[in-house]
């Protein structure tokens, strides 16, 4: 970086090298060049010469003032015009940064995805800080009082094997950067209450051409949890509003859910589950598309969607799992 150059003087910043975005700052340059009484001192920001707000303080020192500095990073250097020198002489350089102290982390959430072997903790970090911000996740056993700390720059995966202090814990998050430090509220968890069942997946759909055509959605999960509650949501792709059906489910066999849908319309389905009575849901599954036939029965199997229709035949169509804004990984 610019800080590695050989200096013939000094460049510095008030109040500090890294400062709160929007502050008024002063950058000073002091020349110490042999046999040179600088005629002029120049400041450069990201290689571009600054023309305004420069004040000469004395024979060797000048100040550049910025009002409401809003750039996250800038490389500053200053030069001197020395008598009898054709080119400007480099004095020194410095990288400066501006940003914000961290917000208080909130919405601290810890879940154990079944079979993952990890407890995953996430939180809302708040506004962008623009500068390096670290998080320390504190996990304290309510049974042994033992506390463990994990350093991260985003979320954290904690091996469940390392949670040896029983089932009940307090979890909280500290956020810190060069401009400040904040701490979240404490979250109390019980390991048995935060398990999210293995992902539910829609495998295929078929429409049976009865007096009233009905569509059967086949879906399954590898979960070993006995009592599972699920929701399936569906809508015509042209609609904004989802319809939601609720199920109490036992995944010892593939689930079949029946829907009475309008003919010749493309529908989208998603499913999510939670351990019955617990707090956290799976994220919604990938989007599963199925177009109801006009009159002919239709099977949609899990592959890529072709939307091809052969008259009088049952044709396999393939469903892609597109992610849309409606498919956020919500676990609340």
């Amino acid at each position: 970086g610019i800080t590695n150059i050989n200096c013939s003087g000094h460049i510095w910043v008030e109040p500090a090298t890294i400062f709160k975005m929007g502050m008024n700052i002063s950058i000073y340059c002091q020349a110490a060049i042999k046999n040179c009484q600088p005629r002029k001192l120049h400041f450069y920001k990201n290689g571009i010469k600054e023309r305004f707000q420069i004040t000469r303080i004395n024979k060797t020192t000048a100040r550049l003032w910025y009002k409401n500095f809003l750039e996250p990073h800038a490389s500053m250097y200053c030069t001197a015009e020395c008598p009898k020198h054709f080119q400007e002489t480099l004095i020194c350089g410095k990288d400066i940064s501006s940003g914000y102290p961290p917000d208080i982390p909130d919405e601290v959430t810890c879940v154990i995805y079944e079979y993952s072997g990890n407890m995953t903790c996430t939180w809302n970090a708040g506004k962008l800080t623009y500068i390096d911000t670290k998080y320390v996740v504190h996990v304290k056993s309510l049974e042994t009082e033992e506390e463990q700390q994990y350093l991260t720059s985003s979320y954290i995966n904690i091996s469940t094997d390392s949670l040896q202090g029983g089932k009940k814990y307090l979890v909280w998050v500290q956020a810190a950067n060069a401009l400040g430090m904040e701490e979240s509220k404490q979250l109390q968890i019980h390991l048995d209450d935060i398990v999210i069942p293995s992902a539910a997946v829609i495998s295929r759909a078929e429409t049976i051409n009865a007096t009233v055509p009905k569509t059967i959605i086949y879906w399954d999960s590898q979960t070993t949890i006995e009592k599972v509650s699920c929701e399936m949501r569906y809508k015509a792709t042209t609609n904004q509003t989802w319809n939601v059906k609720e199920f109490d489910t036992n995944f010892t066999y593939v689930q079949q859910s029946e829907f009475y849908l309008e003919p010749n319309i493309k529908y989208v389905f998603q499913v999510r589950c939670q351990e019955t009575g617990k707090r956290y849901w799976q994220p919604w599954s990938s989007l599963f598309f199925h177009k109801t036939p006009e009159t002919v029965p239709q099977v949609t199997s899990k592959a890529f969607q072709h939307d091809t229709w052969n008259s009088g035949l049952t044709v396999a169509s393939i469903s892609t799992g597109h992610l849309t804004s409606d498919n956020r990984g919500d676990i609340g």
Epitope: T17, F19, D132
Partner: antibody, heavy 117, light 107 residues
Framework: QVQLVQSGAEVKKPGSSVKVSCKAS????????ISWVRQAPGQGLEWMGW????????NYAQKFQGRVTITADESTSTAYMELSSLRSEDTALYYC??????????WGQGTLVTVSS | DIQMTQSPSSLSASVGDRVTITCRAS??????LNWYQQKPGKAPKLLIY???SLQSGVPSRFSGSGSGTDFTLTISSLQPEDFATYYC?????????FGQGTKVEIK
Amino acid sequence: QVQLVQSGAEVKKPGSSVKVSCKASGGTFSSYGISWVRQAPGQGLEWMGWISAIFGTTNYAQKFQGRVTITADESTSTAYMELSSLRSEDTALYYCARPLKQAFDYWGQGTLVTVSS
Amino acid sequence: DIQMTQSPSSLSASVGDRVTITCRASQSITDDLNWYQQKPGKAPKLLIYAASSLQSGVPSRFSGSGSGTDFTLTISSLQPEDFATYYCQQSYSTPLTFGQGTKVEIK
């Protein structure tokens, strides 16, 4: 030669305020900022805040935010630090210091503030 | 806030000894580190700025080194007037913070 001369010792009651002055001479007062640093008896140094006299810009340590006010009077080359809602733990030697090269190269002689009921 | 940790907190040494004091920042502060000497009843005196630059008028037996998070103040040959408390201070970000101090005493 730059000199920073501070006001005399103060004895204050808990809950009251104190205002310490720091007069600069022998240099361009408005060219550089002034910081305030305190030192409790037998303890280390603690930065309280900074003012850029020419621009009136201030920056305070979070710990003192809301209780400290730093001001400057260019016409008299004097900086002031006012600390309110005093408590016994504010008993300390209060220094003004001038930052140069991002370090404090000139210091006042210190003002002892004693908070006692 | 950036925490500054000095070690040792105190040391005993004799005149002529080489003395080393270390200062560690809780995160990288590039070279924005200063060293001060303070004697009882006196204001601190700047020795080293920008990690390794000697302040004018300070004897050359004082030197500073380091960058990032780890810094060192060295007194190459301790003199009687060097018995004092030494502080490091970061000027990388506000609040500006000091180490807790290292007291150099006569052995």
